[in-house]
Interface confidence: low
Amino acid sequence: TIPPHVQKSVNNDMIVTDNNGAVKFPQLCKFCDVRFSTCDNQKSCMSNCSITSICEKPQEVCVAVWRKNDENITLETVCHDPKLPYHDFILEDAASPKCIMKEKKKPGETFFMCSCSSDECNDNIIFSEEYNTSNPDLLLVIFQ
């Protein structure tokens, strides 16, 4: 079996708190960077990433990026600070407990990205239209 794996290390000089002043500790995300994927034309996919990482920056969330071009499909799984753009896009759905893929405009490829704020939430990426922002579950802000 493959042994336990990779940790991205990021700067952090602050403690993040929720609205009640409780310390928000780093969450767990799938973190395989960019890997080839067989996920295509499905309502949802598992990341098939065996790497579970602690996001060392407490405000970081889980992110998944699905890209398809003429040659291949890749899935990127990382931790990222939602205050900062990722692939030049703002993480608009960072408070969601589920990773709901949204298409972004990128020349020469099909590009979907999602972000979420529950442990290992980028392990299950969802493309289905039935999930949308009117779903009350997606409005939950999960504080670790």
């Epitope: 336990p4 990779v6 290390s9 952090n12 780093p26 960077d33 790497i51 990482s53 602690i54 060392e56």
Partner: antibody, heavy 122, light 107 residues
Amino acid sequence: EVQLVESGGGLVQPGGSLRLSCAASGFYFDIYAMTWVRQAPGKGLEWVSVISGSGGTTYYADSVKGRFTISRDNSKNTLYLQMNSLRAEDTAVYYCARRGQYRHIAGATDYWGQGTLVTVSS
Amino acid sequence: DIQMTQSPSSLSASVGDRVTITCRASQSISSYLNWYQQKPGKAPKLLIYAASSLQSGVPSRFSGSGSGTDFTLTISSLQPEDFATYYCQQSYSTPPTFGQGTKVEIK
């Protein structure tokens, strides 16, 4: 068996350069973040730098920022530390270490090399 | 950066003694606290991670406790091979800072 073997240490004059290497074996190198930690003679441990498994993310201690560069060659299972503009205070044993990688062990360095001594002196 | 303060800086003990070393963080680090043992001329060795989890292969006489800012490493019955320097390290944020070390010497 996990093994980390450092090399490249030695005596160098202030302002000089040195490149340390760390040969890794016994584990899937490219999916582990790796760190350099140093220890001045008779002193405690000081974290120097970290690089992610893919090599795409690097961070440095303020004391070495702009002078040291961490890198890795995953095809050779080797970690590097390029040290430029060396100062007397950089004199230390330099250890390469693997960051453990499962949930809470993620921040801990679970395997260390034997270290290589860097002496900066005129 | 988060400062880590260990106490005492050194202690003398006999084989069979119960030894306690404390580590205090300058801010809350949850359970992101690791303990290492280092013998002269050797590399550090991971003993405890996540404040209380025993690293594989480490004798059960070593234990860790604490969360937030205050942590403890306990050796329940000191053995001859335990005379060494012990370091705490926080891995809550980068840079992952170390304590200054506690040297355990033979009385």
